[in-house]
Amino acid sequence: MRTEAQVPALQPPEPGLEGAMGHRTLVLPWVLLTLCVTAGTPEVWVQVRMEATELSSFTIRCGFLGSGSISLVTVSWGGPNGAGGTTLAVLHPERGIRQWAPARQARWETQSSISLILEGSGASSPCANTTFCCKFASFPEGSWEACGSLPPSSDPGLSAPPTPAPILRADLAGILGVSGVLLFGCVYLLHLLRRHKHRPAPRLQPSRTSPQAPRARAWAPSQASQAALHVPYATINTSCRPATLDTAHPHGGPSWWASLPTHAAHRPQGPAAWASTPIPARGSFVSVENGLYAQAGERPPHTGPGLTLFPDPRGPRAMEGPLGVR
């Protein structure tokens, strides 16, 4: 399942305005827009399961649906790793697995999926509504993170189905995964859009969000993400009561959420940055890891010259370049 832009239905142009050529130039941008948003966008899915035998024992399974090669997986709880979350395990495809309490056993299930069993006793044991996050660092897509928790009504031994959590493209590195033709198409799209600024706008069906909002959902952030843009990260309450999201501005958005670091909001980004995302199953939510916060000049592994992706949790020498770059 890919993240698709919800392209609004186009009204036919008024007679004499643009004619057949105008209609074609109107349709083409939306086709290209959809392509730009969907092509090569990977996904991370998270499944949280409470074991029937031990009521406070959890199994977290995560997978990466993308064509790139995974360079590291980090599992955390209580929120995204590095944003207040507690690191539970780090899995490197070639350097092995490291885990910390209450993680009991982390392992690779396949080349693109992992599982983690959590201990069920002690002060640090998880509770039913704890949020678990999996962050996949991959090449060339960059860093992708999804989070999930046990649905509130879950019976022991049951689990939420492994919901693919569509992650918004958050890395410049993703460009590498898109063909030159597509890149050209996106440039052409921008050119067309610029030209359309000087023409009467075609009538679009009103958006459900608000009459003033940009019509293409691909360009319009949800209320939730708009609110989240005012803070570096939405903060997750890690205590054992229903998790709440503290944002600068309360909003009536859906129960799932996507947030970008503040500095990402000011970065020029293509339409993919606001691709509309289907609502995941109850009890799980989507988080976006921007991946553009590596210090200037750092060279994470497998990247081309001068292309920065994300800090490499395998070890800081991976950021030194050329030494330590794997």
Epitope: S76, N81, G82, G85, T86, T87, L88, V90, H92, P93, E94, R95, G96, R98, W100, A101, P102, R107, W108, E109, T110, Q111, I114, S124, P311, D312, P313, R314, G315, P316, R317, A318, M319, G324
Partner: antibody, heavy 114, light 113 residues
Framework: EVQLQQSGPELVKPGASVKISCKAS????????MNWVRQSHGKSLEWIGD????????NYNQKFKGKATLTVGKSSSTAYMELRSLTSEDSAVYYC???????WGTGTTVTVSS | DIVMTQSPSSLSVSAGEKVTMSCKSS????????????LAWYQQKPGQPPKLLIY???TRESGVPDRFTGSGSGTDFTLTISSVQAEDLAVYYC?????????FGGGTKLEIK
């Protein structure tokens, strides 16, 4: 430049305790876990344990449980290891190493002697 | 615990010669999930901390000369130096990256004639 600067050599009496430090610089301390390794004179390397600054619950080699205690000071980007009930067997060079042993500290020589 | 056994314990060669050293583990270091071998090699020169050379049994750490090659799978691994240089004088350790506790071999000391 990524560096792990360890505290200076220690000369301690048997039965005493010592706390050695490893100050990290050149990277975000909380992004990487820290290992501690012992190397007795002219001998091989022994992994003592590891700790992630974002977790705080260390893993220990069973051999060093009760002997070593690992902690971190996030604000100072420093990892600590306390060794207690020292004997002459504990005389060694102690290294800290980040992540998957990618970068190693300068080493701290601990000598236990009466 | 996984026991790592290295051989020979020392060897002396002339510059330009090819050298191979062995490392055997008491349990397989092959991860069944992703079919990777979790073994690393380190070089420790006199008075210095160890330095990572090879990880994943055969992947050379960036900046490591291509004369160093790691090979092997399961329980038997080899480090080869195709043409020994004077600066390669060091002790070489293999390490189990597969399961806690991480264990190191006894080392192979390389001397240059």
């Amino acid at each position: 430049e990524v560096q792990l600067q360890q505290s200076g050599p220690e000369l301690v009496k048997p039965g005493a305790s010592v706390k050695i430090s490893c100050k990290a610089s050149g990277y975000t301390f909380t992004d990487y876990f820290m290992n501690w390794v012992r190397q007795s004179h002219g001998k091989s390397l022994e992994w003592i344990g590891d700790i992630h600054p974002n977790n705080g619950s260390p893993n220990y080699n069973q051999k060093f449980k009760g002997k070593a205690t690992l902690t971190v000071g996030k604000s100072s980007s420093t990892a600590y290891m306390e060794l207690r009930s020292l004997t002459s067997e504990d005389s060694a060079v102690y290294y800290c190493a980040t992540g998957y042993f990618d970068v190693w500290g300068t080493g701290t020589t601990v000598t236990v002697s009466s | 615990d996984i026991v790592m056994t290295q051989s020979p314990s020392s060897l002396s060669v002339s510059a330009g010669e090819k050298v191979t050293m062995s490392c055997k583990s008491s349990q397989s270091l092959l991860n069944s999930g992703n079919q990777k071998n979790y073994l690393a090699w380190y070089q420790q020169k006199p008075g210095q901390p160890p330095k990572l050379l090879i990880y994943g049994a055969s992947t050379r750490e960036s900046g490591v000369p291509d004369r160093f090659t790691g090979s092997g799978s399961g329980t038997d691994f080899t480090l080869t130096i195709s043409s020994v240089q004077a600066e390669d004088l060091a002790v070489y350790y293999c390490q189990n990256d597969h399961s806690y506790p991480w264990t190191f071999g006894g080392g192979t000391k390389l001397e240059i004639k």
